[in-house]
């Protein structure tokens, strides 16, 4: 969480951003809030990116003002116009690119003053893993697959029964480059699985951590997946 202050006229206003991560090829949100102002026509929102000459986005007098927008963001940005009046300056970024990573500034002007805060935006790829029993294998085997990751993650297996056990000797992980030549498909196989146990396949890079759980009993198989972004710090 980054909280910034600015001084203008009577007041400085508080602007708050939250560091976040974008999943390349998908839409992302750069989060920014500010002390709301009841005078919508006086509110100006500017998004800037370090090292980029033009603006990322500008909203003023109740609408987008994109005449000074940098080419790399053309047609890819939008604020939540209906939410500006209640202090939401968050930016929607369409079709996130690897090159969108960097330091952004959310700069706000209202009738009460000015303020800004920086935001670290990481980009990569992350996806939910799915763990299945591999019935084609000669022994009881689990197969963990996740379709899109970047940068290359680590994969670690864990078990509820054998807590703390190291499964690296009985697992095999491969990374297969996807067609766009950036992201990779993650496949990890765990051998010598016992029933009546819960196994977890944990995939992690510097952006996200995802876990796929599978519980195998004689009568049923239960699965659960969870994904967590690692860098959601507010400013």
């Amino acid at each position: 969480l980054i909280i910034g202050f600015g001084i203008s006229g009577r007041h400085s206003i508080t602007v708050t951003t939250v560091a976040s991560a974008g999943n390349i090829g998908e839409d992302g949100i750069l989060s920014c809030t500010f002390e709301p102002d009841i005078k919508l026509s006086d509110i100006v929102i500017q998004w800037l990116k370090e090292g980029v000459l033009g603006l990322v986005h500008e909203f003023k007098e109740g609408k987008d003002e994109l005449s000074e927008q940098d080419e790399m963001f053309r047609g890819r940005t939008a604020v939540f116009a209906d939410q500006v009046i209640v202090g939401n300056a968050s930016l929607r970024l369409k079709n996130v690119q690897l090159t969108d990573a960097g330091t952004y500034k959310c700069y706000i002007i209202t009738s009460k003053g000015k303020g800004n805060a920086n935001l670290e935006y990481k980009t990569g790829a992350f996806s939910m893993p799915e763990v299945n029993v591999d019935y084609n294998a000669s022994s009881e085997t689990l197969r963990c697959e996740a379709p899109r990751w970047f940068p290359q993650p680590t994969v670690v297996w864990a078990s509820q029964v054998d807590q703390g056990a190291n499964f690296s000797e009985v697992s095999n992980t491969s990374f297969e480059l996807n067609s766009e030549n950036v992201t990779m498909k993650v496949v990890s196989v765990l051998y010598n699985v016992t029933i009546n146990n819960t196994y977890s396949c944990m995939i992690e890079n510097d952006i996200a951590k995802a876990t796929g759980d599978i519980k195998v009993t004689e009568s049923e198989i239960k699965r659960r997946s969870h994904l967590q972004l690692l860098n959601s710090k507010a400013s």
């Epitope: 709301p36 005078k39 919508l40 026509s41 116009a81 009046i85 202090g87 009460k112």
Partner: antibody
Framework: EVQLVQSGAEVKKPGASVKVSCKVS????????MHWVRQAPGQGLEWIGA????????EYAPKFQGRVTLTADTSTSTAYMELSSLRSEDTAVYYC??????????WGQGTTVTVSS | DIQMTQSPSSLSASVGDRVTITCQAT??????LNWYQQKPGKPPKFAIY???QLAEGVPSRFSGSGSGTDYTLTISSLQPEDFATYYC?????????FGGGTKVEIK
């Protein structure tokens, strides 16, 4: 659940003052503007003013400037509207209304103020 | 101040009718317009925000449209519970201003 609960009806004499309260629950009171709107019998809605409780910033409609005072007690999440030098044309239902998710999204139940000699 | 002219001031309609209410601003309000429904003895109820977005719990027979200075609230098929007074509100320029209201009555 968001709730704005206002104080009860008041009967006042011309020249007197009235203070109406609005107790808020269900959202962060200090971080959003609270507005006051009134409605004379059989008439439309008229904006009086607004307060930002976190900083006690206030904005008033020019018509009410100098005669209305908006305050807030952040410890009890209660907003107050005081109108002075009352006259018969101030007879109305007075509403508090929040701007939490959108402009005037939640409303109090209203407080009837009657000014009569 | 921006003036909001709402029309008609009242209308009579039957259940099932399509009803249209308009609000005209004295200048461009850039879609910064909400609609409220009020029944006798009750506070106004938030119905439509930012010209066309339905508030939570509002039936899909209600819709809003418009841009610039001209805005419309439409009820596609009037239901018994829709008989009420409707107000528009502009919040683009300070101070916020309401339209004069439209009373929708049973024919």
């Amino acid at each position: 659940e968001v709730q704005l609960v206002q104080s009860g009806a008041e009967v006042k004499k011309p020249g007197a003052s009235v203070k109406v309260s609005c107790k808020v629950s269900g959202y962060p009171f200090t971080s959003y503007w609270m507005h006051w709107v009134r409605q004379a019998p059989g008439q439309g809605l008229e904006w009086i003013g607004a307060i930002y409780p976190g900083k006690s910033d206030t904005e008033y409609a020019p018509k009410f400037q100098g005669r209305v005072t908006l305050t807030a007690d952040t410890s009890t999440s209660t907003a107050y509207m005081e109108l002075s030098s009352l006259r018969s044309e101030d007879t109305a239902v007075y509403y508090c209304t929040s701007t939490w998710t959108h402009y005037f999204d939640y409303w109090g139940q209203g407080t009837t103020v009657t000014v009569s000699s | 101040d921006i003036q909001m002219t709402q029309s008609p001031s009242s209308l009579s309609a039957s259940v099932g009718d399509r009803v249209t209410i308009t609000c005209q601003a004295t200048q461009d309000i850039v879609k910064s317009l909400n609609w409220y429904q009020q029944k006798p003895g009750k506070p106004p109820k938030f119905a439509i925000y930012y010209t066309a977005q339905l508030a939570e719990g509002v039936p899909s027979r209600f819709s809003g449209s418009g841009s610039g200075t001209d805005y419309t609230l439409t009820i596609s098929s009037l239901q018994p519970e829709d008989f009420a007074t409707y107000y528009c509100l502009q919040f683009y320029e300070f101070p916020p201003t309401f339209g004069g209201g439209t009373k929708v009555e049973i024919k």
